[in-house]
C-alpha cells in the first residue's frame, strides 16, 4: 500500500494506491483512491507513467480529457466515472501488454488540495493449472497443464502422504511457446503416483503462484485449483 500526500500550495490530500499485476492480453485495473470531494466538477485525476511523455489518462470536469494521452494508451483506458465522486480514481486498462509494466503515478486535485501516490505495475501471464490422470501412460501418471505463463515459471510437485518429498526425479516439465510468441503453455507430468493420495502441482513466477490439486481414490477423483497474485502491496 502506498499512501501519498499533497505538496505545497493548497492543503494536501491522501491518495492511496495498491501495487498490482496485469495478465497479458486481458484487462487490468490500477487501483487508486483519494479523499472524496462533494463536487465532481472540482476533481481532476491524472494517471502518468514513468518514462512515457504523454498522459496515461486524464479525467476532469466530470469527463475524460484525452488530448494529452500517449498513443500507447489510446482507446485502452477508463476510470469508473460513477465512482469518482466517492474517491475511486482506479484505472481500467484494456488488453494489457508486457510494455505496460512500470511505475505509475495517480495524481489527484480536488477543492481540498492535491495529492499523489506511485504504483508499481507488473505484467506477465498466469493461469489456473488443471491436473488430470493420464490414462494414456504406461504407469499411473498425472498431467498438470496451464495454458499461459510468462516469465517462465518453476513447477514443483508435492504430495500429502509424502510431505517434503522431492519429486523432481519422477516428473518432467516442458514449456511450449504459444502462438503470440510471448506466453507459454506449461505441461508437467508426474510418474509413479499412488492412489489414496493428494498431489499438488505448484506453478510460480515472480507475478503469481498457482496450485492444482488432485485426490485420487479407487472410487473417485477430486480436483481443486487456485491462483494467487504475489507482491500486491498498498502505497
Amino acid at each position: 500500500l502506498i499512501i501519498g500526500f499533497g505538496i505545497s500550495g493548497r492543503h494536501s490530500i491522501t491518495v492511496t494506491t495498491v501495487a498490482s499485476a496485469g495478465n497479458i492480453g486481458e484487462d487490468g485495473i490500477l487501483s487508486c483512491t483519494f479523499e472524496p470531494d462533494i463536487k465532481l466538477s472540482d476533481i481532476v485525476i491524472q494517471w502518468l507513467k514513468e518514462g512515457v511523455l504523454g498522459l496515461v489518462h486524464e479525467f476532469k470536469e466530470g469527463k475524460d480529457e484525452l488530448s494529452e494521452q500517449d498513443e500507447m494508451f489510446r482507446g485502452r483506458t477508463a476510470v469508473f466515472a460513477d465512482q469518482v465522486i466517492v474517491g475511486n480514481a482506479s484505472l481500467r486498462l484494456k488488453n494489457v501488454q508486457l510494455t505496460d509494466a512500470g511505475t505509475y503515478k495517480c495524481y489527484i486535485i480536488t477543492s481540498k488540495g492535491k495529492g499523489n501516490a506511485n504504483l508499481e505495475y507488473k505484467t506477465g501471464a498466469f493461469s489456473m493449472p488443471e491436473v488430470n490422470v493420464d490414462y494414456n501412460a504406461s504407469s499411473e501418471t498425472l498431467r498438470c497443464e496451464a495454458p499461459r505463463w510468462f516469465p517462465q515459471p518453476t513447477v514443483v510437485w508435492a504430495s500429502q502422504v509424502d510431505q517434503g518429498a522431492n519429486f523432481s526425479e519422477v516428473s518432467n516439465t516442458s514449456f511450449e511457446l504459444n502462438s503470440e510468441n510471448v506466453t507459454m503453455k506449461v505441461v508437467s507430468v508426474l510418474y509413479n503416483v499412488t492412489i489414496n493420495n493428494t498431489y499438488s502441482c505448484m506453478i510460480e513466477n515472480d507475478i503469481a503462484k498457482a496450485t492444482g490439486d488432485i485426490k485420487v481414490t479407487e472410487s473417485e477423483i477430486k480436483r481443486r485449483s487456485h491462483l494467487q497474485l504475489l507482491n500486491s502491496k498498498a502505497s
Partner: antibody, heavy 120, light 107 residues
Framework: QLQLQESGPGLVKPSETLSLTCTVS??????????WGWIRQPPGKGLEWIGN???????YYNPSLKSRVTISVDTSKNQFSLKLSSVTAADTAVYYC????????????WGQGILVTVSS | EIVMTQSPATLSVSPGERATLSCRAS??????LAWYQQKPGQAPRLLIY???TRATGIPARFSGSGSGTEFTLTISSLQSEDFAVYYC?????????FGGGTKVEIK
C-alpha cells in the same frame, strides 16, 4: 439527442479522392469521452472500421487503409471529415460516421450512411 | 488483426421462438465485444457492449454472454421487428474488426 449526418458526393471517379463530412448535432464534438469514427460497408457485405479521430486532432487508422486515409476535425463547425485517396471500384460502399466510446469502444450512435460509388 | 467469425450465416426462426447467434474470435478479446443489429437500408444499431451489457433502450429479450474467444447473442422471444442482420465487433485491439454477420429470417 445526439445525431450524426454524412454528406458528400455519391459518385467519385477512379484514382480520385473521396471526401465526406460528418456533422454532429445535439451534442459537442469536444465531449472528452469519445472518439469520432468512420466505418464502411460494401453493398451486400460486412462492416469495415476505417479509423477515428479525437477532437484534439489525434487520429488512428486501419492499417489496411492507412496509406490512403486522412481524417480531420473542425470543432468550430462540430464536424469531422474523411478523405480516401486513389479510389477504385473496391471502395464503393455505404460510408457511416459514428461516435466511438474512448473505452469501451462501441459505436453509438451512427449516421444513416451515404452510398459512394466509384465509377468512371 | 483479430478475425471475427459468426455462425450460422442465416438463422430461420419463427416469431416467439428463441434465437442463439454465435461469434468466435481468432484470439482472446476478453469481454471487449459489441453486438449490432442492422435492418435493410438502415445503419447498424448498438445492442450490447462489454459482451453482456445492454445498450440504453434495448429490450431485455436481448442478452449477450461469453468472454475470451466464444460469444453468444440470445434473443429470448423473437418479435417481428427483430428480423435483421446481426454483427459482432471486437474492440480489444486495433484495428477494430466485425464479424461477417448473421441474418435472422422468418421461418
Amino acid at each position: 439527442q445526439l445525431q450524426l449526418q454524412e454528406s458528400g458526393p455519391g459518385l467519385v471517379k477512379p484514382s480520385e479522392t473521396l471526401s465526406l463530412t460528418c456533422t454532429v448535432s445535439g451534442g459537442s464534438i469536444k465531449s472528452g469521452s469519445y472518439y469520432w469514427g468512420w466505418i464502411r460497408q460494401p453493398p451486400g457485405k460486412g462492416l469495415e472500421w476505417i479509423g477515428n479521430i479525437y477532437y484534439s486532432g489525434s487520429t488512428y487508422y486501419n492499417p489496411s487503409l492507412k496509406s490512403r486515409v486522412t481524417i480531420s476535425v473542425d470543432t468550430s463547425k462540430n464536424q469531422f471529415s474523411l478523405k480516401l485517396s486513389s479510389v477504385t471500384a473496391a471502395d464503393t460502399a455505404v460510408y457511416y460516421c459514428a461516435r466511438e466510446g474512448s473505452y469501451p469502444n462501441q459505436f453509438d450512435p451512427w449516421g444513416q450512411g451515404i452510398l459512394v460509388t466509384v465509377s468512371s | 488483426e483479430i478475425v471475427m467469425t459468426q455462425s450460422p450465416a442465416t438463422l430461420s426462426v419463427s416469431p416467439g421462438e428463441r434465437a442463439t447467434l454465435s461469434c468466435r474470435a481468432s484470439q482472446s478479446v476478453s469481454s471487449n465485444l459489441a453486438w449490432y443489429q442492422q435492418k435493410p437500408g438502415q445503419a447498424p444499431r448498438l445492442l450490447i457492449y462489454g459482451a453482456s451489457t445492454r445498450a440504453t433502450g434495448i429490450p431485455a429479450r436481448f442478452s449477450g454472454s461469453g468472454s475470451g474467444t466464444e460469444f453468444t447473442l440470445t434473443i429470448s422471444s423473437l418479435q417481428s421487428e427483430d428480423f435483421a442482420v446481426y454483427y459482432c465487433q471486437q474492440y480489444h485491439s486495433f484495428p477494430f474488426t466485425f464479424g461477417g454477420g448473421t441474418k435472422v429470417e422468418i421461418k
